[in-house]
């Protein structure tokens, strides 16, 4: 299924990079590269003109989700697509456009006094509690952070960086989603690229914090580019 | 209530396969992650491999070199682990644990594996 | 793959004690560290997931501490139903792997 790939436990073995590239709207997290599933890496080169490649809703803009361009595609490449409107068939939240969400299957406009109440009846805010606390649905739901009562703490699973408290983001880690620190200066971050073939990355480093860029170090320029080191860095 | 039925104790010979079964419920099979853990008599617990059963999608420890499948059944809420070319050193309990984050909250009862001429 | 050290082996305490184990891993793990308990014939039970945040239903006399790759696991006050083998598991890299176990006692 589609929804086997967006939210937080998936564990992939056919995904496109993960993390968005500079000036992407969706992008949160960055993955580190080295710390692959076993296996090759099925995900072929997508070239610079098509759309942009994704593994799950976070990584695509706001008017956007991440799926498989053609019914029954292949998993493995999933691109950033524009959000459905109103009375649009639907299979989960984050299809719909801001101001609406999925319900039997269609998209319709938010009733903010119904979906607050299904929200605080089916989500908890860590995994800690386990999952044995939460059903089916509540798991694959795309929220904002003013649906839940508190923000997660470091360690705790998330569905979206909005879901973690200020200074942590929303990033993979194996087959879940955890909120991880926003990166510091001098920290090792991910520079991403739009095209490429990439191995499967299913360890997310945050982004940069507030002023600083993720670019190589400067003592690393005349390595190969396969060693470039790249470090959050004063713009 | 989570709930992880496994399948009852085997007794192998060398070289044969072994399927071990693992029964989820009170959950839904297809959200979470389906590992399975083994332990041998005495000793310390290792990880196997783990399965997306809404997809199939696996990973295995590259220890078991290929010995190892890891299927699921979403019809039946179940997911199987077969271990191949048996050896005496594969005699343990075989545990299957469904979990969200990175970690295994929910354990299976265990199934014991005997490898024995 | 990431070796995980545990020590003691083994340990022996009394109802009440403060008991510590310790979890060595071989390369900085940040906080990605679990420890389980496991009592004989039994399935593990998830005690302690990211360093130090208690899993549900888990009593607050158990708790965790450390980073990077020295990690501590105390019981503040030992009770009876404690004794058990307790494992630590770093999931910073695949594949995950465990510590060789610490075995608790009764004195």
């Known amino acids: 299924t589609l929804n086997s790939v967006l939210n937080s436990n998936a564990i992939k073995n056919l995904p496109p990079p993960l993390g968005g590239a500079a000036g992407h709207p969706g992008s949160a997290v960055s993955a580190a590269p080295g710390i692959l599933y076993p296996g090759g890496n099925k995900y072929q080169t997508i070239d610079n003109y098509q759309p942009y490649p994704c593994a799950e809703d976070e990584e695509c803009g706001t008017d956007e989700y991440c799926a498989s361009p053609t019914r029954g595609g292949d998993a493995g490449v999933q691109i950033c697509l524009a959000c459905r409107k109103r009375r649009k068939r639907c299979m989960r939240h984050a299809m719909c456009c801001p101001g609406n969400y999925c319900k039997n299957g269609i998209c319709v406009s938010s009733d903010q006094n119904h979906f607050r109440g299904e929200i605080e009846e089916t989500i908890t805010e860590s995994f800690g509690n386990d999952h044995s606390t939460l059903d089916g649905y509540s798991r694959r739901t795309t929220l904002s952070s003013k649906m839940y009562h508190t923000k997660g703490q470091e360690g705790s699973v998330c569905l979206r960086s909005s879901d973690c408290a200020s200074g942590l983001c929303c990033a993979r880690h194996f087959w879940s989603k955890i909120c991880k620190p926003v990166l510091k200066e001098g920290q090792v971050c991910t520079k991403h690229r739009r095209k490429g073939s990439h191995g499967l990355e299913i360890f997310q480093r945050c982004y940069c914090g507030e002023g600083l860029s993720c670019r190589i170090q400067k003592d690393h320029h005349q390595a190969s580019n396969s060693s470039r080191l790249h470090t959050c860095q004063r713009h | 209530q989570v709930q992880l039925v496994q399948s009852g104790a085997e007794v192998k010979k060398p070289g044969s396969s072994v399927k071990v079964s693992c029964k989820a419920s009170?959950?839904?099979?297809?959200?979470?992650?389906m590992h399975w853990v083994r332990q041998a008599p005495g000793q310390g617990l290792e990880w196997m491999g783990v399965?997306?059963?809404?997809?199939?999608?696996?990973s295995y420890n590259q220890k078991f070199k290929g010995r190892v499948t890891i299927t699921a059944d979403k019809s039946t809420s179940t997911a199987y682990m077969e271990l191949s070319s048996l050896r005496s050193e594969d005699t343990a309990v075989y545990y299957c644990?469904?979990?969200?984050?990175?970690?295994?909250?929910?354990w299976g009862q265990g199934t014991l594996v005997t490898v024995s001429s | 793959d990431i070796q995980m050290t545990q020590s003691p082996s083994s340990l022996s305490a009394s109802v009440g004690d403060r008991v510590t184990i310790t979890c060595r891993a071989s390369?900085?793990?940040?906080?990605?560290l679990n420890w389980y308990q496991q009592k004989p014939g039994k399935a593990p039970k998830l005690l302690i997931y990211?360093?130090?945040r208690l899993h549900s239903g888990v009593p607050s006399r158990f708790s965790g501490s450390g980073s990077g790759t020295d990690f501590t696991f105390t019981i503040s006050s030992l009770q009876p139903e404690d004794i058990a083998t307790y494992y630590c598991?770093?999931?910073?890299?695949?594949?995950?792997?465990f510590g060789q176990g610490t075995k608790l006692e009764i004195k």
């Open positions: 644990s469904s979990t969200t984050g990175p970690w295994f909250a929910s």
């Open positions: 009170g959950y839904t099979f297809t959200e979470y992650t």
């Open positions: 390369q900085d793990i940040s906080n990605y």
């Open positions: 399965i997306d059963p809404s997809n199939g999608d696996t």
């Open positions: 598991q770093q999931v910073h890299t695949l594949p995950p792997t």
């Open positions: 990211y360093k130090s």
